[in-house]
Interface confidence: low
């Protein structure tokens, strides 16, 4: 008698390893013999698909070589025209040994930044990922974490994080290891020991000492008044990633000597600098070495700051002093765009009067430095917050500018208007309450090394635009 199909062996979940054989059985009783079709995820499996074998009148479906993508719900449907079609479904779970699909790669990273070592895995059951540093399992902490993806994230990378790493992917079917990769930690150049300022007699020998560190070990260059040091002998030694440089000088003129430590990170450089002044005892007027001339200011940047038809000192060590000094001011003003409305006019006045110093004409034209009190007013009253930020930015190398040296004077080294009112220049555009100046004690001592108390301390008290790059 005709009999509607009945599935006597319902489909079950089948577990299979990649590249192995997986078989679903769909035993059917019926008369006449039914037609059996198979679907995967509701899509018909074609009889001529060579990846499958269908036997026993369609009751056996075999996947000949299981692939990762074969995961899904398989259904058999039996129909012989008597009664309705019947269906049974089961799942194929593809089991897979761990496989590392995106292994870690060698990384060079700057200290303090975030490092991510990738380790993307495949496998079923989902592999757990752990990391080995050197020969020991890596412990997670507040800085070091293994992400959901398996990647290793290290916040605020430290020197001690450098080393060899590999990731391990593990599930019930096996374990996979990545190749060993190297994490190299680079460190911005930093000055450990700044050169010290000296007040010496004409013809003395002075040794300036500068020590710096960084990874890679930085190089040290010395700058004299903005130019490469032309005389003097330099001795250098390197030990344990610390470079020590000594510049020996025969002193015939005063100068600002800057130690610049530079190291390279890929295509970028990081730079740290510290400056020292060499002053000559009894040095009151520039000698013939101090080449320059007095001329009316004809630039633009300082037009609103300098007195109309101001006579300024133009330094002939520049091929085009007007343009070069204009450029110096302009570059600094670029950095001043972000400072407060209180600080900006004061800082601009200080910069213009420092770079375009008032000039005393005569047989030997003489630049007149800014009075100490005006410098301190800018530093401590108008721009106290910005000054500290700028010093920190300079130290951390956050300025984009390439200027090798652009600094306002060290205030404490400037002459006081209490010593000789004609020996220093005032800032007429600095519109502050004269009472503010009285908060600075009058300088009774004749020693220029006496400091105003509570100045922000720094290895170089220059307010400078650093020649470094933002490492983005």
């Amino acid at each position: 008698l005709p009999k509607a199909p009945v599935i006597t062996t319902p489909l079950e979940t089948v577990d299979a390893l990649v590249e192995e054989v997986a078989t679903f059985m769909c035993a059917v009783e019926s008369y006449p013999q039914p037609e059996i079709s198979w679907t995967r995820n509701k899509i018909l499996i074609k009889l001529f698909d060579t990846r499958y074998s269908i036997r026993e009148n369609g009751q056996l479906l075999t996947i000949l070589s299981v692939e990762d993508s074969d995961d899904g719900i398989y259904c058999c449907t039996a129909n012989n025209g008597v009664g309705g079609a019947v269906e049974s479904c089961g799942a194929l779970q593809v089991k897979m040994k761990p496989k590392i699909t995106r292994p870690p790669i060698n990384v060079k990273i700057i200290e303090g930044l975030k490092a991510v070592l990738p380790c993307t895995t495949m496998g079923n059951p989902k592999p757990s990922v752990s990391w080995i540093k050197g020969d020991s399992p890596l412990r997670e902490n507040s800085r070091i974490a293994v992400l959901e993806s398996g990647s290793l994230r290290i916040h605020n990378v430290q020197k001690e994080d450098a080393g060899q790493y590999r990731c391990v992917a593990k599930n019930s079917l096996g374990t996979a290891y990545s190749k060993v990769v190297k994490l190299e930690v680079e460190v911005f150049a930093r000055i450990l020991r700044a050169p010290e300022s000296h007040n010496v007699t004409f013809g003395s020998f002075v040794t300036l000492h500068c020590t710096a560190t960084g990874i890679p070990v930085p190089t040290i260059t010395w700058i004299e008044n903005g130019n490469a040091v032309s005389s003097g002998s330099i001795q250098e030694s390197v030990k344990d990633r610390v470079i020590d440089s000594r510049l020996q000088l025969f002193i015939t003129k005063p100068g600002l000597y800057t130690c610049i430590a530079t190291n390279k990170h890929g295509e970028k450089f990081s730079t740290a600098k510290a400056a020292a002044t060499i002053s000559i005892a009894e040095w009151s007027k520039p000698q013939k070495d101090n080449k320059g001339y007095c001329a009316q200011y004809r630039g633009e940047v300082c037009n609103a700051v300098l007195a109309k038809d101001a006579l300024v000192f133009l330094n002939t060590s520049y091929a085009d002093p007007e343009e070069a000094q204009e450029l110096l001011v302009h570059t600094a003003w670029n950095e001043l765009k972000v400072v407060s409305p209180v600080c900006r006019p004061a800082a601009e006045a200080l910069l213009c009067n420092h770079i375009f110093q008032e000039c005393s004409p005569g047989v030997v034209p003489t630049p007149i430095p800014i009075c100490r009190e005006y410098c301190l007013a800018v530093k401590e009253l108008f721009c106290a917050k910005e000054w500290l930020v700028m010093e920190e930015k300079t130290h951390r190398g956050l300025y984009r500018s390439e200027m090798h040296l652009l600094s306002v004077p060290e205030c404490s080294k400037l002459p006081s208007m209490h010593w000789d009112p004609t020996a220093c220049a005032r800032l007429p555009h600095l519109d502050y309450n004269k009472e503010n100046l009285k908060t600075f004690p009058p300088m009774t001592s004749s020693k220029p090394s006496v400091d105003i108390p509570n100045l922000p301390s720094s290895s170089s008290s220059s307010f400078s635009v650093s020649p470094t790059y933002s490492m983005t």
């Epitope: 295509e267 970028k268 633009e300 091929a319 670029n334 200027m403």
Partner: antibody, heavy 126, light 107 residues
Framework: EVQLVESGGGLVQPGGSLRLSCAAS????????IHWVRQAPGKGLEWVAS????????SYADSVKGRFTISADTSKNTAYLQMNSLRAEDTAVYYC???????????????????WGQGTLVTVSS | DIQMTQSPSSLSASVGDRVTITCRAS??????VAWYQQKPGKAPKLLIY???SLYSGVPSRFSGSRSGTDFTLTISSLQPEDFATYYC?????????FGQGTKVEIK
């Protein structure tokens, strides 16, 4: 005679990379800054990047920052522009140009690009 | 970024005409403006630097001037070889920016 010759252009798929070279003769690139300027078909000039060989200082237009890297090899008197993650909008003729710089100052207040190469075409298309 | 607004975008003129092209900077760029000439399929050529300085080898019929943030390129007597596209460019602030160009065509 001062000359700049670009090479390395060509057809590349989006997301791909190219490295352009700019070989200089008749002057040393260490005494100059080298700039890359591009021009999309039928469009105007767009500054891309520059390098001051003496200091290593580099600067980039926002549109290429993080994708392009300018460098220079003073021993070969050649500048390079490494272009990664290229996009269709990077399609252009790329020129290298020099700004002669007697002073060791950055190019904030410079005097114009006095010599240019003939240009090399970069086409980014799938 | 500094906008360099160049006008006109194109102009028709005859040989011998006096031609003036202007460029306005969106803020002060001092005198750091250069002018370039470009012919189809060729690289640009420097004509004027520092707003008004004539680059060596450039004919004296080309001149540049500045008034505040307005910059002008003048060709006193247009010659057949002057039909080209002209660009202004500022180099005072980064990024360096160019005007959109002025095409000088034969009337």
């Amino acid at each position: 005679e001062v000359q700049l010759v670009e090479s390395g252009g060509g057809l590349v798929q989006p997301g791909g990379s190219l490295r352009l070279s700019c070989a200089a003769s008749g002057f040393t690139i260490s005494s100059s800054s080298i700039h890359w300027v591009r021009q999309a078909p039928g469009k105007g000039l767009e500054w891309v990047a520059s390098i001051s060989s003496s200091s290593g200082y580099t600067s980039y237009a926002d549109s290429v920052k993080g994708r392009f890297t300018i460098s220079a090899d003073t021993s070969k008197n050649t500048a390079y522009l490494q272009m990664n993650s290229l996009r269709a909008e990077d399609t252009a003729v790329y020129y290298c140009a020099r700004k002669y710089s007697k002073r060791a100052y950055p190019d904030y207040y410079w005097r114009g690009l006095d010599y240019w190469g003939q240009g090399t075409l970069v086409t980014v298309s799938s | 970024d500094i906008q360099m607004t160049q006008s006109p975008s194109s102009l028709s003129a005859s040989v011998g005409d006096r031609v003036t092209i202007t460029c306005r900077a969106s803020q002060s760029v001092s005198s750091a403006v250069a002018w370039y000439q470009q012919k189809p399929g060729k690289a640009p050529k420097l004509l004027i630097y520092s707003a008004s300085s004539l680059y060596s080898g450039v004919p004296s019929r080309f001149s540049g001037s500045r008034s505040g943030t307005d910059f002008t390129l003048t060709i006193s007597s247009l010659q057949p070889e002057d039909f080209a596209t002209y660009y202004c460019q500022q180099s005072y602030w980064w990024p360096i920016t160019f005007g959109q160009g002025t095409k000088v065509e034969i009337k």
